[in-house]
């Protein structure tokens, strides 16, 4: 399955929107920075495309879930958030179309299941952090910067997949 060129453009737009969503300076939140343990190894180049697409799908789905909560709506600009949802939704559709085309429909390798679980646990840590910090502006800013980093890394994986074709 070939992810459309618009998919990588959408990824760049998503990163741009995340950057624009910034409301406060992270320099006022240095003490709130946190290591969420992004499972970078799950996004390594060792995977076949059949294994990466469900992991990428999980990543984007979890970002969508994170920013779709009531607490998130209160934290961010509504217009930017709506554009952000639209970009994520389109990327989810692109990835789902690939799965339907037959990539990853065979018996799920254990490694892929472990990777999806690692991504879910990563987002659980982020959710727990926000809860512990009572969804403060600094906590959301730390999370926004973290999602920018992890999304950027997963985007790099998509690009490396494309270049291998």
């Amino acid at each position: 399955c070939d992810l459309p060129q618009t998919h990588s453009l959408g990824s760049r737009r998503t990163l741009m929107l995340l950057a624009q969503m910034r409301r406060i300076s992270l320099f006022s939140c240095l003490k709130d920075r946190h290591d969420f343990g992004f499972p970078q190894e799950e996004f390594g180049n060792q995977f076949q495309k059949a294994e990466t697409i469900p992991v990428l799908h999980e990543m984007i789905q979890q970002i969508f879930n994170l920013f779709s909560t009531k607490d998130s709506s209160a934290a961010w600009d509504e217009t930017l958030l709506d554009k952000f949802y639209t970009e994520l939704y389109q990327q989810l559709n692109d990835l789902e179309a690939c799965v339907i085309q037959g990539v990853g429909v065979t018996e799920t390798p254990l490694m892929k299941e472990d990777s999806i679980l690692a991504v879910r646990k990563y987002f659980q840590r982020i959710t727990l952090y926000l809860k512990e910090k009572k969804y403060s502006p600094c906590a959301w800013e730390v999370v926004r910067a973290e999602i920018m980093r992890s999304f950027s890394l997963s985007t790099n994986l998509q690009e490396s997949l494309r270049s291998k074709e």
Partner: antibody
Framework: QVQLQESGTVLARPGASVKMSCKAS????????MHWVKQRPGQGLEWIGV????????TYNQKFKDKAKLTAVTSANTAYMELSSLTNEDSAVYFC?????????????WGQGTTVTVSS | DIVLTQSPASLAVSLGQRATISCRAS??????????MHWYQQKPGQTPKLLIY???NLESGVPARFSGSGSGTDFTLNIHPVEEEDAATYYC?????????FGSGTKLEIK
């Protein structure tokens, strides 16, 4: 590729002001913090401050808050630093540097530096 | 301000041997799993180059002979085996709190 092109050598009188520029290319200028760093001849590095070109948000090292003013013009992809009330202590090379890794605050790309010489 | 003390101020190392540079912070620069200490290399007449970020992460394109370690207040940059092109001044920098500061530098000479 990412490039930061700084203005050339500046010679200024004590008490004067100078404004140097840093033109960015090869990346999204508005979404990366831009740091400024001072290096006196044969000496170490000093962090002056940082600007977010996307909205002009600035954070300064308190030591430089009355000395340096950081601005950016997004339409020109250019960051600026103005130094006022110059003294001999301000004679140095000034680097603009791009922020890296979001909230780690390291500097991955550096301009070639603007040399400022203050002399009467 | 957090003061970063680098030692030694200069060292001479034979080709192929190990160079060890230390950076001590006056206050911890580690929080919640990250150590906000970074290392740069500056060759004469050139701009600084990022080598290591977050104490131990090798920047893309930097040779594997460079490595960083440490947490809290004590950090180390190791170069092994040292090559001719490694002759430079090395700086540590923290981003634990404002203002960010740099070490005074360590000049490495290759014998």
């Amino acid at each position: 590729q990412v490039q930061l092109q700084e203005s050339g050598t500046v010679l200024a009188r004590p008490g004067a002001s100078v404004k140097m520029s840093c033109k960015a290319s090869g990346y999204s200028f508005t979404t990366y913090w831009m740091h400024w760093v001072k290096q006196r001849p044969g000496q170490g590095l000093e962090w002056i401050g940082v600007i977010y070109p996307g909205n002009g948000d600035t954070t300064y090292n308190q030591k430089f808050k009355d000395k340096a003013k950081l601005t950016a013009v997004t339409s020109a992809n250019t960051a600026y630093m103005e130094l006022s009330s110059l003294t001999n202590e301000d004679s140095a090379v000034y680097f603009c540097t791009r922020n890296y890794k979001y909230d780690y605050y390291t500097m991955d790309y550096w301009g070639q530096g603007t040399t400022v010489t203050v002399s009467s | 301000d957090i003061v970063l003390t680098q030692s030694p101020a200069s060292l001479a190392v034979s080709l192929g041997q190990r160079a060890t540079i230390s950076c001590r912070a006056s206050k911890s620069v580690s929080t919640s799993g990250h150590s906000y200490m970074h290392w740069y290399q500056q060759k004469p007449g050139q701009t600084p180059k990022l080598l290591i970020y977050l104490a131990s992460n090798l920047e893309s394109g930097v040779p594997a002979r460079f490595s960083g370690s440490g947490s809290g207040t004590d950090f180390t940059l190791n170069i092994h085996p040292v090559e001719e092109e490694d002759a430079a001044t090395y700086y540590c920098q923290h981003s634990g709190e404002l203002p960010f500061t740099f070490g005074s530098g360590t000049k490495l000479e290759i014998k």
